[in-house]
């Protein structure tokens, strides 16, 4: 069966029907490049006016305008708010009332696209494997990133969160139109990784999405992540304004000027320092969501009532922090280089600015306890990675899981740890799962490109797709069309249950209280330390003044991860697509 032309609020669209075998039978309808909104520079998105005739939705549209990896040029375009749909079809009748999974990509709120990295037309975020294996509809889309998506003056003149509003427009479009493609508009799951995972979290917290989202999955990121909210957007807006020659004293005049500035100039006015700086790299990412009093009306920690009826899966990779550790402490990955106590202390103090000297010392002490018994370089390097993983991913995710569970009415809560080791040959032998390593398995790459993977990789991918799509169907990762290797029990506040995802998932993979000692340290010991104000404004700009100076944080909550690798059109597959 195949859909043919589908009528949407914008008009008719026609995709392509791809047979899954030469013998006919099952197939997938694929629609690429359906417009879901339009947007002017630094303005909220608006409904697309539509078209006449039948739109041929057969090619991915360009990504939203963003800097290239070298940060000396741009690619993509401003006209970028398009979405893509994969609809699995059986032999006879066209599908109807299927669960819908809407993907939000990561990229530090700075880069990325709905189709993901591409190698020889093999796109990372190709929804075909998830759709056909899980019998769900998959939707991916573009949203604005970087200054064009998140620049804010912190007031009504440039409220920011344009990229988040783009995401909302896509979700709302799906709600209004997906029935025509055979989807169930009352069963929408949003899922994403890193900045996409934090976006998923923010969308569930925003009052704008009331009634739109049934379930959510956050992979390595949360609204509570210290890199997910910018607390001092005006500083960064002024930095950009100065670079492009706009006035900075009056936010109204600054906003008016920025809106008529060449968008490419705005994009290139911000440069991310990727060489080691005085502070952790995540401090230097400026253009991220803000608490605007509207779309995000309050600090995310105060918005969990809004998730009371949204089922949630949240988890991290066991070495999510590795990517950032390699930038902050480059010796981590170099066998011939050593990590020193001083290196680690500098990293710790950079992440604990808000609590000053006492915070840095207490944190350093607990993380280096094992160094007395085992002062090996391997242990010290693993500590650096564990610390970055905890601060940037684990602790915010654990707090969010507890908040979700505590506020749940009908909602169910599930937690996981992805531990299937990275396949990067250049990594140390002790390496676990790096940031973004989970993506290739969720999107079924071991099946789509089997020659590049081992049977154990296919086992991981099969299990993840089964759990993810069962959850989208029923709100329970164990119940649905796909058999799973073991029962995944819900998260409880008492036991902190989580599923450890490895190549062999058994009943022993259900574990409890992940890194409990460190969670208690951050939630209790560190939390009660007095916040200091004196030495927080000492962040110095990068040496090259073409790179944007970091914002003096008013607390330690505005750090954001940084991409060391490109997710550009020609990135190798499988690629590490960060954040």
């Amino acid at each position: 069966a195949k859909l043919g032309a589908v009528y949407t609020e914008g008009g008719f669209v026609e995709g392509v029907n791809k047979k899954l075998s030469l013998l006919g039978g099952d197939s997938v309808d694929i629609f690429k490049g359906i417009p879901f909104a339009t947007a002017k520079t630094l303005e909220n998105p608006q409904r697309h006016p539509g078209w006449q005739g039948t739109l041929k939705a057969t090619n991915f549209k360009k990504r939203c305008l963003q800097a290239t990896i070298t940060q000396d040029n741009t690619y993509g375009q401003e006209d970028c708010l398009y979405l893509n749909i994969w609809v699995p079809q059986g032999r006879k009748q066209v599908s109807h009332n299927l669960p819908v999974m809407v993907w939000i990509y990561g990229g530090a709120f700075l880069m990325g696209s709905g189709q993901g990295a591409n190698f020889l037309k093999n796109y990372l975020y190709d929804g075909e494997e998830i759709a056909t294996r899980g019998n769900v509809i998959v939707v991916t889309f573009n949203y604005r990133v970087g200054p064009l998506g998140f620049l804010s003056t912190g007031d009504a003149n440039l409220p920011g969160n344009f990229g988040l509003r783009d995401q909302h427009m896509a979700i709302a479009w799906v709600k209004r139109n997906i029935a025509a493609f055979g989807g169930d508009p009352d069963n929408i799951t949003i899922f994403g990784e890193s900045a996409g995972a934090a976006s998923v979290s923010l969308q569930t917290l925003s009052p704008y999405n009331k009634g739109l989202i049934r379930r959510a999955i956050s992979q390595s990121g949360m609204a509570l992540s210290p890199w997910a909210i910018q607390k001092n957007p005006l500083f960064w807006a002024k930095t950009i304004a100065k670079k492009v020659g706009c006035p900075t004293e009056d936010t109204g005049k600054m906003a008016a000027c920025l809106k008529i500035t060449d968008p490419r100039a705005l994009t290139l006015a911000y440069k991310l320092p990727v060489k080691k700086q005085e502070y952790p790299v995540v401090h230097y990412l400026a253009f991220i969501p803000v608490i605007d009093g509207d779309f995000i009306p309050d600090d995310p920690i105060n918005l969990y009532n809004n998730t009371a009826d949204i089922d949630y899966i949240a988890g991290i990779n066991n070495m999510d922090g590795h990517l950032f550790a390699t930038i902050d402490v480059p010796a981590v990955d170099k066998t011939k280089q050593t990590v020193t106590e001083e290196d680690f202390y500098r990293l710790v103090s950079g992440h604990t600015v808000a609590k000053g000297l006492k915070g840095a010392q207490a944190t350093f002490d607990i993380y280096t306890e094992s160094w007395a018994q085992d002062p090996s370089q391997e242990n010290m390097k693993k500590t650096v990675v564990a610390f970055e993983t905890d601060v940037l991913f684990l602790i915010p995710t654990e707090i969010a899981l507890a908040q979700h569970k505590a506020h749940a009415k009908s909602a169910k809560t599930y937690s996981y740890l992805f531990s299937h080791p990275s396949r990067m040959p250049i990594y140390p032998k002790w390496m676990g799962a790096d940031h973004a390593d989970d993506l290739q398995y969720v999107f079924g790459k071991p099946f789509a490109t089997p020659l590049g993977y081992r049977p154990q990789d296919r086992a991981v991918s099969k299990a993840m797709i089964a759990y993810w799509t069962n959850f989208a169907r029923s709100g329970d990762p164990n119940m649905g069309n796909s058999p799973v290797p073991t029962h995944w029990y819900p998260y409880t506040l008492e036991n902190g249950n989580y599923l450890d995802i490895t190549k062999t998932i058994t009943s022993a993979s259900m574990k409890e209280h992940l890194r409990e000692k460190f969670l208690k340290f951050w939630a209790v010991t560190f939390e009660v330390l007095p916040t200091v104000t004196g030495d927080q404004d000492t962040l110095t700009p990068p040496e090259d003044d073409s790179e944007v100076a970091p914002d003096p944080p008013s607390d330690d909550s505005q750090v954001v991860p940084v991409p060391p690798t490109d997710d550009s059109v020609e990135a190798q597959m499988p690629a590490t697509i960060g954040f």
């Epitope: 032309a5 709600k175 139109n177 029935a179 739109l212």
Partner: antibody, heavy 119, light 105 residues
Amino acid sequence: QVQLVQSGAEVKKPGASVKVSCKASGYTFTSYNMHWVRQAPGQGLEWMGVINPGDGATSYTQKFQGRVTMTRDTSTSTVYMELSSLRSEDTAVYYCARDYYGSSPLGYWGQGTLVTVSS
Amino acid sequence: DIQMTQSPSSLSASVGDRVTITCRASPSISYMNWYQQKPGKAPKLLIYAASSLPSGVPSRFSGSGSGTDFTLTISSLQPEDFATYYCQQRSSSPTFGQGTKLEIK
């Protein structure tokens, strides 16, 4: 100017079919979608479906799926709506209506065709 | 399907009055359209995209709203304005409100 002229009133028996025509003029026929909307006596408006006269693509609301067929004849700039297995509750005025612009509201309407279903 | 709730279902007013008709959508929608229909006639487009007036529609008609709540306002009723008014949302399956009959008081 845009004009949509519909065929005349029809009286049908239950179980029969009816085919209503809508002839368009004053614009490029294949450039705008044509919708069909019906209104039962003393009732509100009900959208039935839409046809793209350019390629003949159609979409029908769930309620009429399997009973309604919309076609077009580009040589005469006419669209047709056929409703089968008529029942008494199908008694209504049937309107064709053209998009105003883009995917927009229904900006131009035919005069309506009364279809009466009675035994 | 998107549900449309129009209120009031009927309304009595006098020439010169200011009249407001509301339409609530569930879930939220992007844009709302409004139509006027007189007895025995086809509907006529009055407001599109929540607040835009097609050419030929008098400026006493205005529309506002976003998300779930939309309003049609007639600033000063004229004799020819007594009719039935319908709101309509545009999704993959467009739906109309049940109508508001505006009568002379």
